[in-house]
């Protein structure tokens, strides 16, 4: 039975040219996280495998940095980065948990950054 829940940074906004941390946290389960996939729509951004470490998709290598923790840092943001991002936690023995973050990249310099948290 899947008892866990995913907490995310929710809906966030950031300035064009800036950077933002996408963060998810899996709680309320003792399941082992074996892999976390980060996707934008249906495009793979990065994988963090518990044993093998990070893989960043070649097309995003210049603008995506791993971490902090199992999160992902997006850099040099453009308006085209606006959209849904998904953290997909693959766990044993529970299975798959998915979190959703909506990022809006604004031209304005008064973009409010959503609350961010770190995984302890």
């Amino acid at each position: 039975m899947m008892t866990g829940t995913i907490e995310t940074t929710g809906n966030i906004s950031a300035e064009k040219g800036g950077s933002i941390i996408l963060q998810c946290h899996l709680s309320s389960t003792t399941a082992q996280v074996t892999q976390v996939n980060w996707e934008q729509q249906d495009q793979l951004l990065a994988i963090c495998n518990a044993d093998l470490g990070w893989h960043i998709s070649p097309s995003f290598k210049d603008r995506v940095a791993p971490g902090p923790g199992l999160g992902l840092t997006l850099q040099s943001l453009t308006v085209n980065d606006t959209g849904e991002y998904f953290c997909i936690y693959h766990t044993y023995p529970d299975g798959t948990y998915t979190g959703r973050i909506f990022l809006e990249v604004l031209e304005s310099s008064v973009a409010e950054h959503g609350a961010r948290f770190q995984i302890p």
């Epitope: 892999q35 996939n37 249906d42 793979l44 994988i47 495998n49 093998l52 893989h55």
Partner: antibody, heavy 123, light 107 residues
Framework: QVQLVQSGAEVKKPGASVKVSCKAS????????MGWVRQAPGQGLEWMGI????????SYTQKFRGRVTMTRDTSTSTVYMELSSLASEDTAVYYC????????????????WGQGTMVTVSS | EIVMTQSPATLSVSPGERATLSCRAS??????LAWYQQKPGQAPRHLIY???TRATGIPARFSGSGSGTEFTLTISSLQSEDFAVYYC?????????FGGGTKVEIK
């Protein structure tokens, strides 16, 4: 040309261990992860795990954790797969197979395969 | 883990005919799917990656399609050397898993 040459067939008693080798040639050994796949007689393919020949990092399928050890020797471009506490259900052909992509574990499709090593577990 | 299910288990086809093999994933694997061919006593041979891209040296009669959870391998006109067992494999979530295989036999 890329070649993966595996060690010869083995016959083992239940409870024993087996160590299969896979010698690589024709490419830069440390640039490609190596996977291990097994196939029981008349059955399908079963993924066992993977090793990064550069760093030695490994990832094993849950089913085999605690029983399988994958290692490498960069001086001889050889990877090894050791399986312990053998039972009759471990009777299978064991294959090493190279991941196509250079320098990463993704995308993990297997472009070159060893010829296979038959391991028979029988009392 | 992601379960890959292939159908049918056995496909009886006459030489020159078309063969259509199916592979279904228990959850989306996007286009992260490969196909392999295996003949008796031999190691598997890589045919397709990215669900639809042929590996180097693979004849054009082999084509792959699909995305998400439903995939198809089509052999447009079966040659005698194509009678074998075919496996699909997902490579987006560890452990990477194979389907149970489809045996293509001579009708």
């Amino acid at each position: 040309q890329v070649q993966l040459v595996q060690s010869g067939a083995e016959v083992k008693k239940p409870g024993a261990s087996v160590k299969v080798s896979c010698k690589a040639s024709g490419y830069t050994f440390t640039s490609h992860y190596m996977g291990w796949v097994r196939q029981a007689p008349g059955q399908g393919l079963e993924w066992m795990g993977i090793i990064n020949p550069s760093m030695g990092a490994t990832s094993y399928t849950q089913k085999f954790r605690g029983r399988v050890t994958m290692t490498r020797d960069t001086s001889t471009s050889t990877v090894y797969m050791e399986l312990s506490s053998l039972a009759s259900e471990d009777t299978a052909v064991y294959y090493c197979a190279r991941l196509h992509v250079s320098g990463s574990y993704y995308p993990a499709y297997l472009d070159y395969w060893g010829q296979g090593t038959m391991v028979t577990v029988s009392s | 883990e992601i379960v890959m299910t292939q159908s049918p288990a056995t496909l009886s086809v006459s030489p020159g005919e078309r063969a259509t093999l199916s592979c279904r994933a228990s959850q989306s694997v996007s286009s992260n799917l490969a196909w392999y061919q295996q003949k008796p006593g031999q190691a598997p041979r890589h045919l397709i990656y990215g669900a639809s891209t042929r590996a180097t040296g693979i004849p054009a009669r082999f084509s792959g399609s699909g995305s998400g959870t439903e995939f198809t391998l089509t052999i447009s006109s079966l040659q005698s050397e194509d009678f074998a067992v075919y496996y699909c494999q997902q490579y987006i979530v560890f452990p990477w898993t194979f389907g149970g295989g489809t045996k293509v036999e001579i009708k």
